[in-house]
């Protein structure tokens, strides 16, 4: 029979190759069927009989078309600082990732070796760069006219409210206190909001305030992105 309509097992043309989802069996010297994902070769082919496939047992898998005699073992259960983001099935291995509020501080071939808690910026400091699955939060001191009164891995520096009459001036860790009943907010370039953090973390980013035209509004120079070593906390 011509190769394109041959049924497995069959001898390939001299110098030819086996078709997609087939492999060349050295012992039988024939093109034989591979097993689909989720299965493995229970019995290898011969000159007269094709590969016999069988389902992977519990906690084992094959992800590709294959002719392996045994399925691969799924990895261990996820460590307590990780969560299972993909379950072990017959067709895929378990995948563990760092739990919400944590990031991968050191990854290795086998996955994340060390998860670490995201840095929390203390009052007077805001998030300059949000954490990702593989990088920590970067904190920066709040620029003049902005503040953060929280210990948080997501909160940025927010602009002080603008008062007609100031009762207590704001500082880096406290908002201004007004005596009037209708304070407004300045929109300081140094307080531009960051993109939301990655979806693996709870999000507490403040809504973006509208620009204000209240009397006394001053525009501030944006703060550079390089933060000092301090300004984070583990509390």
């Amino acid at each position: 029979l011509p190769a394109q309509v041959a049924f497995t097992p069959y001898a390939p043309e001299p110098g030819g190759t086996c078709r997609l989802r087939e492999y060349y069996d050295q012992t039988a010297q024939m093109c034989c069927s591979k097993c689909p994902p989720g299965q493995h070769a229970k019995v290898f082919c011969t000159k007269t009989s094709d590969t016999v496939c069988d389902s992977c047992e519990d906690s084992t898998y094959t992800q590709l078309w294959n002719w392996v005699p045994e399925c691969l073992s799924c990895g261990s259960r996820c460590s307590s600082d990780q969560v299972e983001t993909q379950a072990c099935t017959r067709e895929q291995n378990r995948i563990c990732t760092c739990r919400p509020g944590w990031y991968c501080a050191l990854s290795k071939q086998e996955g994340c070796r060390l998860c670490a808690q995201l840095r929390k910026c203390r009052p007077g400091f805001g998030v300059a760069r949000p954490g990702t699955e593989t990088s920590d939060v970067v904190c920066k001191p709040c620029a003049p006219g902005t503040f953060s009164n929280t210990t948080s891995s997501t909160d940025i520096c927010r602009p002080h409210q603008i008062c007609h009459v100031v009762a207590i001036p704001g500082n880096a860790s406290m908002d201004a206190v007004c005596t009037s009943t209708s304070p407004t907010r300045s929109m300081a370039p140094g307080a531009v909001h960051l993109p939301q953090p990655v979806s693996t973390r709870s999000q507490h980013t403040q809504p973006t305030p509208a620009p204000s035209t209240a009397p006394g509004t001053s525009f501030l120079l944006p703060v550079g992105p390089s933060p000092p070593a301090e300004g984070s906390t583990g509390d």
Partner: antibody, heavy 124, light 112 residues
Framework: QVQLVQSGAEVKKPGASVKVSCKAS????????LSWVRQAPGQGLEWMGW????????NYAQNLQDRVTMTTDTSTSTAYMELRSLRSDDMAVYYC?????????????????WGQGTMVTVSS | DIVMTQTPLSSPVTLGQPASISCRSS???????????LNWLQQRPGQPPRLLIY???NRFSGVPDRFSGSGAGTDFTLKISRVEAEDVGVYYC?????????FGQGTRLEIK
């Protein structure tokens, strides 16, 4: 041979800062992590944090995160640990320890080489 | 944080006799990569700690074969088959499975 040599003993006043150095020799500095561990007089071991010598990334113990900074100078294969706003309960022997964690799957993943320790006394 | 608890805290032994130290972790030390990152350290008087055993049962280079480690999950043991005078000191178990790295409170080995 593989060794870590630390700077000498320090006496500091409360509120001051101390910077301890740890010079590595006998191995490829960039291929390992370095942890800092302290031991108060008559007490057990407390992990302070670590630095990945390959990329400079750090992770600190939560209770020290505000006050500690770990750095490396790869040109001299030296690691540094600075502790600020010293208190009386910071009085301890400070150790640097090589952490064999950056290499292959068969690495020890343990603190395999230790410095001789640096005594930091905090007294007014 | 993973809490490491050692027993006993003090162990008086006779030279040439065996000694055993137990270490229990508050949660499993099996990492998702399949390894168990439980190590044993020895600290002789006036000296820095020294690595004895890594990943539960692997002796570090230069460590005498009278030291052995065993265990799994949350329960681990360090055994000394025949105690020698140079074994006097404090022994710590430590986990490097996850942050923060934690140590047992130490077991003091002394000669009777």
């Amino acid at each position: 041979q593989v060794q870590l040599v630390q700077s000498g003993a320090e006496v500091k006043k409360p509120g001051a800062s101390v910077k301890v150095s740890c010079k590595a020799s006998g191995y490829t500095f960039l291929s390992y992590g370095l942890s800092w561990v302290r031991q108060a007089p008559g007490q057990g071991l407390e992990w302070m944090g670590w630095i990945n010598a390959y990329n400079g990334n750090t992770n600190y113990a939560q209770n020290l995160q505000d006050r500690v900074t770990m750095t490396t100078d790869t040109s001299t294969s030296t690691a540094y640990m600075e502790l600020r706003s010293l208190r009386s309960d910071d009085m301890a022997v400070y150790y640097c320890a090589r952490w064999d964690i950056l290499t292959a799957y068969y690495s020890s993943d343990a603190f395999d080489i230790w410095g001789q320790g640096t005594m930091v006394t905090v007294s007014s | 944080d993973i809490v490491m608890t050692q027993t006993p805290l003090s162990s008086p032994v006779t030279l040439g006799q065996p000694a055993s130290i137990s270490c229990r972790s508050s949660q499993s030390l099996v990492h998702s990569d399949g390894n168990t990152y439980l190590n044993w350290l020895q600290q002789r008087p006036g000296q820095p700690p020294r690595l004895l055993i890594y990943k539960v049962s692997n002796r570090f280079s230069g460590v005498p074969d009278r030291f052995s480690g065993s265990g799994a999950g949350t329960d681990f043991t360090l055994k000394i088959s025949r105690v020698e005078a140079e074994d006097v000191g404090v022994y710590y178990c430590t986990q490097t499975t996850q942050f923060p790295i934690t140590f047992g409170q130490g077991t003091r080995l002394e000669i009777k």
